[in-house]
């Protein structure tokens, strides 16, 4: 038996930040679980982890180069990624594992979310504008 995961197909980070919500076909309340976010088509780079259990507060881990926070819903984990760089544009996959109570469960691979990080293109106003035309 596998948990199903739903993610937005695409998110655009205009201000170098994005909320990626991972929605599960499973209630995480009073469970020990590990939710993670993986970068790349082959899910090779784990960038963010949220660990939760019934007796302590949520623990969030960010890989060096990523600034990540996590929020827990009954059937979701939302990863808040900040300070993203344009070169971190990629497809990101949500993963979930539930360890306790038994049985151990994990998810069917999701379709992923393309996070498109838009660069900040600031148009500076000229310091010394030319003479205005009448």
């Amino acid at each position: 038996n596998k948990i199903l995961v739903k993610q937005s197909p695409m998110l655009v980070a205009y201000d170098n930040a994005v909320n990626l919500s991972c929605k599960y076909s499973y209630n995480l309340f009073s469970r020990e679980f590990r939710a993670s976010l993986h970068k790349g088509l082959d899910s090779a780079v784990e960038v963010c982890v949220v660990y939760g259990n019934y007796s302590q507060q949520l623990q969030v881990y960010s890989k060096t180069g990523f600034n990540c926070d996590g929020k827990l819903g009954n059937e979701s984990v939302t990863f808040y990624l900040q300070n993203l760089y344009v070169n971190q544009t990629d497809i990101y996959f949500c993963k979930i594992e539930v360890m306790y109570p038994p049985p151990y469960l994990d998810n069917e691979k999701s379709n992923g979310t393309i996070i498109h990080v838009k660069g900040k293109h600031l148009c500076p106003s000229p310091l010394f504008p030319g003479p205005s035309k009448p």
Epitope: R34, E46, V49, Y51, Y61, E97, M99
Partner: nanobody, 124 residues
Framework: EVQLVESGGGEVQPGGSLRLSCAAS????????MGWFRQAPGKEREFVAA????????DYAESVKGRFTISRDNAKNTVYLQMSSLRAEDTAVYYC?????????????????WGQGTLVTVKP
């Protein structure tokens, strides 16, 4: 809950070698990392080396690169620290740590569980 038991510490002469072991037990997920930190008398606990479950990510403190090697046996849930060319400044209590992060983290705050420590003494 994860339990960690270290072994392998002892006294050795400068230039000598030791191998530390750390066995983990408890509920494990498909990825996590284990690391070694050390604490000399009157000093902060500092990062030495770490490795993740998939063994595709390892990291070392600059001071031990080329002298120490971290490895793990996933079938035994055990991580090893092979220490060679030991110096007097390597004398410390060595602690094994466990983190739910899936990469070789050097950040002490990422580690959730710690072993009891094993003493390594390097002296002529």
């Amino acid at each position: 809950e994860v339990q960690l038991v270290e072994s392998g510490g002892g006294e050795v002469q400068p230039g000598g070698s030791l191998r530390l072991s750390c066995a983990a037990s408890g509920r494990m997920f498909s990825n996590y990392a284990m690391g070694w930190f050390r604490q000399a008398p009157g000093k902060e606990r500092e990062f030495v080396a770490a490795i993740n479950y998939r063994r595709d990510d390892a990291d070392y403190a600059e001071s031990v690169k080329g002298r120490f090697t971290i490895s793990r046996d996933n079938a035994k849930n055990t991580v090893y620290l092979q220490m060679s060319s030991l110096r007097a400044e390597d004398t410390a209590v060595y602690y094994c740590g466990f983190t739910y992060a899936g990469w070789a983290s050097s950040r002490r705050d990422d580690y959730n569980y710690w072993g009891q420590g094993t003493l390594v003494t390097v002296k002529p």
